[in-house]
């Protein structure tokens, strides 16, 4: 029973401008039925699954992946994809994630939302098993 | 192979309490929400509670038949979810599942809880 | 919390024959509603999720529709062995609440 799987889209909260040792949410959206969400890190190198799914509205499921304490490594780019059985979305549009030395000071801008659209790829649909492994030949390290 | 063992039913008296285990292997358990399922004899399908991970903060949610008595926990170092059973009732008796995720596909064979004087 | 009425609570059918269940939630719940088959002695297996698309290893001759509050579930060409209990629950929103169940009888 095929069907096609819109993209999912990601975003972060409060916003993707943190300062250094505060947390932030990634939250990745999709469709009703969703089995296990994908943070991606990175061209897909890194990943963090999740099969902890609620729902978002009567029409979308979420995730949410959280950094406690955000560190200058965690700056850069990240994305969203799903597994529903029987086959894997595409991925969302990257969002990039930046990181500034907190100054505390009364004049520190408000953290910013905000996207930055990238390429997607589709993973090859024979790289999935029940446990949502990377795609073959990448070595499986978490994002955090 | 997803396997989800519960243990730890049995009699107990009315006020009494129980604390039910399920023993999850066969998948990546720290990233699912797990959850307890009931079944009164000859009865229907009742939600217990509801344990989210890590990443979700261990929010708990439990059904309000259960509210105040019953405890979900769980020990990723040790794949296992736990409900502590309090005040219990001779309602309580039932079948309790142990149910992964949150679509319900992978289910323990349960184990009977009896309340009885 | 939602309510979920499921009907028939029992239904006789022959060999062959199709079967439909409904269930009908007290408010919206978009498609976060799933089916269970349940035969005797046996925990519940999952046949249908987000109220259409069907799990895995499960017979094509299962299915589901419906959308929002009315959901309906159908057995086409029974065979011997799906006449056991079936259930349908909502998964919108704690309490996770199940029908009350419809048992399959041979007619």
């Known amino acids: 029973q095929e069907e096609d799987l819109p993209r999912p889209s990601i975003s972060a909260e409060p916003g993707t401008v943190i300062p250094l040792g505060s947390h932030v949410t990634f939250v990745c959206r999709g469709p009703v039925g969703v089995q296990t969400f994908r943070l991606e890190r990175d061209s897909r190198s890194t990943y963090n699954d999740t099969e902890d799914v609620s729902q978002a509205s009567p029409s979308e499921s979420e995730a949410r992946f959280r950094i406690d304490s955000v560190r200058e490594g965690n700056a850069g780019l990240y994305r969203c994809i799903y597994y529903k059985p029987p086959k894997w979305s595409e991925q969302s549009d990257y969002l990039e994630l930046l990181v500034k030395e907190s100054s505390g000071g009364p004049d520190s801008p408000d953290t910013e939302p905000g996207s930055s659209a990238g390429p997607t790829q589709r993973p090859s649909d024979n790289s999935h098993n029940e446990h949502a492994p990377a795609s073959q030949g990448l070595k499986a390290e978490h994002l955090y | 192979e997803v396997q989800l063992v519960e243990s730890g039913g049995g009699l107990v008296q009315p006020k009494g309490s129980l604390k039910l285990s399920c023993a999850a292997s066969?998948?990546?358990?720290?990233?699912?929400?797990m959850n307890w399922v009931r079944q009164a004899p000859g009865k229907g399908l009742e939600w217990v509670a509801r344990?989210?991970?890590?990443?979700?903060?261990?929010?708990?949610y439990y059904a309000d038949s259960v509210k105040d008595r019953f405890t979900i926990s769980r020990d990723d170092s040790e794949s296992m979810v736990y409900l502590q059973m309090n005040n219990l009732k001779t309602e309580d008796t039932a079948m309790y599942y142990c149910?992964?995720?949150?679509?319900?596909?992978?289910w323990g064979q349960g184990t009977l809880v009896t309340v009885s004087a | 919390d939602i309510q979920m009425t499921q009907s028939p609570a029992s239904q006789s059918a022959s060999l062959g024959e199709s079967v439909t269940i409904t269930c009908l939630a007290s408010?919206?719940?978009?498609?976060?509603l799933a089916w269970y088959q349940q035969k005797p002695g046996k925990s519940p297996q999952l046949l249908i999720y987000?109220?259409?698309s069907l799990a895995d290893g499960v017979p094509s001759r299962f299915s589901g529709s419906g959308s929002g509050t009315k959901f309906s579930f159908k057995i086409s060409s029974l065979q011997a062995e799906d006449f056991v209990s079936y259930y349908c629950?909502?998964?919108?929103?704690?309490?996770?609440?199940f029908g009350a169940g419809t048992k399959l009888e041979l007619k």
């Open positions: 408010q919206t719940i978009g498609t976060w």
């Open positions: 629950q909502q998964l919108y929103s704690t309490p996770l609440t």
């Open positions: 149910v992964r995720s949150l679509w319900f596909v992978y």
């Open positions: 987000a109220a259409t």
């Open positions: 066969g998948f990546s358990f720290n990233i699912n929400a």
């Open positions: 344990i989210r991970s890590k990443s979700n903060n261990y929010e708990t």
